[in-house]
Each structure stands twice: as C-alpha cells, then as structure tokens.
C-alpha cells in the first residue's frame, strides 16, 4: 500500500481543515488508514482523523481544530496500521479556503432596485470576518448567455443593482462566494443559489 498523491490540505481558518490524497489502488480509507495531526506546541497532543473515501483510490479527512492563528503549524502522519506511509506538515494560514457565505436573499420590494444580502460565514472575533470580499453570480434560467459576475470589494455583505439591468419578466438565480486577499486564499465554494422572478415597470417612452 502506497500513497500515489500526497495529502494536500486547506483550512477554513476557523475549526476545520480538509486533507485529500490518493492511494495507489482501491482503498477502504476508513478501515485501513488513519491521519494523525498535532499542533506544534509544547502542550499539544496528537489527534486522530478517520478518513472517508473520495472516489476509488481517493481519501478525504476533516481535521477538527479549536481555532487557528497565523503562527500555527501542524505535523501530519498518515498510517496504515503500524506502517507510516507519509509524514508532512501543514500551516493552515498558508492554505485558506474560506467558508461559503450563507442566507442569500433577494429583496425585490425596493423600487426598481434589487437588493441582494447574505451572511458573513465567520463570527466577529475571527480574523477573516473583516477581510472577506465577495463575488456575486447572477444568471438567467432561460438564457445561458445571460450570465454575469459582480465583484463586491467592500466589507458589507450586500449588493444593489438596478432591476432594469436584468431582463423583465423572467426568472434569475444568484449565488455568492468569498475570498480574503490578506491570506491570498482560494475562493470559497458557492453559496446555495436563490431564485426570483425579475419584473419592473418599463419607463414610458417619450415621443
């Protein structure tokens, strides 16, 4: 039994880091393998992660962490029974994938304006709370070409757009994702999408 692709890990910079790797053949990850992880700190102890299968030869493990600070460094040991298959380290602050925003809502009751709001996925005491920027994706269910991205570079989790920038009388969907420049993170996953029917009063034509 050998590791084909070494574990790579990403952290949500809050409580979970996810590590993925591939074995050289079909493996029952949860019964055959264990990933031991330990914070490099005098008084820390090793914790065991039981991996799950992620495709035939792929494994994934969700490492639980109390919290994360920039100096944190973890040692990782991948075991198959008594055999050490791989040894490495992981610094969560250097491999951050933010949590996805939630509670995306489209408010259509503001005159001729669409207000999209969503929730910051981090609590106020987390460092990323004040460092997230967002991308909002809006697309038409009827027209695949009607697909647009709005970059929200301010901290407020909201976006206002004129309803008239979208076609009237058809349904649209929106989703949002986040990233943080300060840690050069990857983009989060997209939030679940939300749907609304876009309708607005066309202005009277002047003759």
């Amino acid at each position: 039994m050998k590791v084909l692709q070494e574990p790579t890990c990403v952290s949500d910079y809050m409580s979970i880091s996810t590590c993925e790797w591939k074995m050289n053949g079909p493996t029952n990850c949860s019964t055959e393998l264990r990933l031991l992880y330990q914070l490099v700190f005098l008084l820390s102890e090793a914790h065991t992660c039981i991996p799950e299968n992620n495709g035939g030869a792929g494994c994934v493990c969700h490492l639980l962490m109390d919290d994360v600070v920039s100096a944190d460094n973890y040692t990782l040991d991948l075991w198959a029974g008594q055999q050490l298959l791989w040894k490495g380290s992981f610094k969560p602050s250097e491999h951050v994938k933010p949590r996805a925003p939630g509670n995306l809502t489209v408010h259509t009751n503001v005159s001729d304006t669409l207000l999209l709001t969503w929730s910051n996925p981090y609590p106020p005491d987390n460092y990323l709370y004040n460092h997230l920027t967002y991308a909002v994706n809006i697309w038409s269910e009827n027209d695949p070409a009607d697909f647009r991205i709005y970059n929200v570079t301010y901290l407020e989790p909201s976006l206002r757009i004129a309803a008239s920038t979208l076609k009237s009388g058809i349904s649209y969907r929106a989703r949002v994702r986040a990233w943080a420049q300060c840690y050069n993170t990857t983009w989060s996953e997209w939030s679940p999408s939300t749907k609304w029917h876009n309708s607005y009063r066309e202005p009277f034509e002047q003759h």
Partner: antibody, heavy 116, light 109 residues
Framework: EVQLLESGGGLVQPGGSLRLSCAAS????????MAWVRQAPGKGLEWVSA????????YYADSVKGRFTISRDNSKNTLYLQMNSLRAEDTAVYYC?????????WGQGTLVTVSS | SVLTQPPSASGTPGQRVTISCSGS????????FNWYQQLPGTAPKLLIY???HRPSGVPDRFSGSKSGTSASLAISGLRSEDEADYYC???????????LGGGTKLTVL
Amino acid sequence: EVQLLESGGGLVQPGGSLRLSCAASGFTFSRHAMAWVRQAPGKGLEWVSAITSSGRSIYYADSVKGRFTISRDNSKNTLYLQMNSLRAEDTAVYYCARVHRAFDYWGQGTLVTVSS
Amino acid sequence: SVLTQPPSASGTPGQRVTISCSGSAALDLSPSFNWYQQLPGTAPKLLIYADSHRPSGVPDRFSGSKSGTSASLAISGLRSEDEADYYCGTWDYSLSGYVLGGGTKLTVL
C-alpha cells in the same frame, strides 16, 4: 462560563507538604492542557508546572523539579499540585490556569505560606 | 531573565503607551508572545496571545506586535482603569517550559 477554583493553601512548616486542588467547570476539561503559576508577595508571576490534556506529558520549572508533582483527574474535572519539601521561597499565591496557546483563564488563587 | 521588561511605564489619560518585552539570545528563534494584565489585588487576565490576537472581550485599544525575539504591547486611549501590572510570556522549547517577564507597572497620571 469558565471557572477555576483553587483550594488547599495554608500555612506549612519548611520541609512540609501540601496538596493544592483546582476544580474546573464551564468547559471540557479533558480537552485542555492546564498549568500552575505562582506569585510571591510583591513579586512577579512565575510559571510552576504544566500538564497536557491527557496527562501524558508533564513539565516543571527548575525551581520545583523533584519536589512538586502535577496531576489531573479528568473524570473529576480537577487539577492537582502535590508540593513536598517546601521552602520559605515557595511562599506565594498559587494560580491554576487553563492553557490554550497561552494561559487564557485563571483562578483567583490560593495562598501558600511556608514559615516556621 | 529570558524576557526583559521595563519595571515601570506611565502615561496620561487618552495617551498611547507602549511596553516592550525583549527576549534574550537563549530564546527560540521565533517565539510566540502573550501578554497578561493584572489589576491590583486580582488574578492575571490574558490580554494578547500569539503575538497580536485579542481574546473576545478585550478592547481593541490593546494591541500586540512582534519583531524577532522581542514584542510590544500598545495601549491607546489610555484610561485610569488600565493602571495595572503587565507581563509578557512565551513558551520556551529549549527549557521545556514557560517564561514570564518581570512585569511592568503602568501608572496613569
């Protein structure tokens, strides 16, 4: 709410023994390392000893090595410090502290006086 | 001592005050510093951990920074209730223990 309550302090003669206890509540005791820190009257803080969450690893300051023993009972949510061969310079308020990278929660302390 | 602090510091209300903590050559190359506040007659309280992180409930008037084996605690908008003893500390892996500075007594004039 995290609470740490020390007990067991008092007056003891040089060469004597004392056992301090620290009752913990408001958090999962078995998941946290713990420590003892002391403060002699009018002096600064001095780290005494620390123990990992399971009790597998233990550390002592040179000044108490061989005389003090730290231990814990995770089933009772209690931290202990057995102090033997006490000296006048061990006179101090002894604080119990939870460890999360630093000493993030402290008890109110218990006074140990070593005097004849 | 492995960590050296000035014995005293002072400032007037509203002022910004900085307390230094200098690590000796015996200290690890990249220590992580913590700061504690001890108000008169009370137990110490964690103010800053891992160089610059504030526990919840600590006002943002308190900030920490690090440069090599030295650290600083800054208090802006000084208040009378900030009058206390301040200690820096770090885990010393060569000693397998925790070291604390001698403490700095802050007086608000």
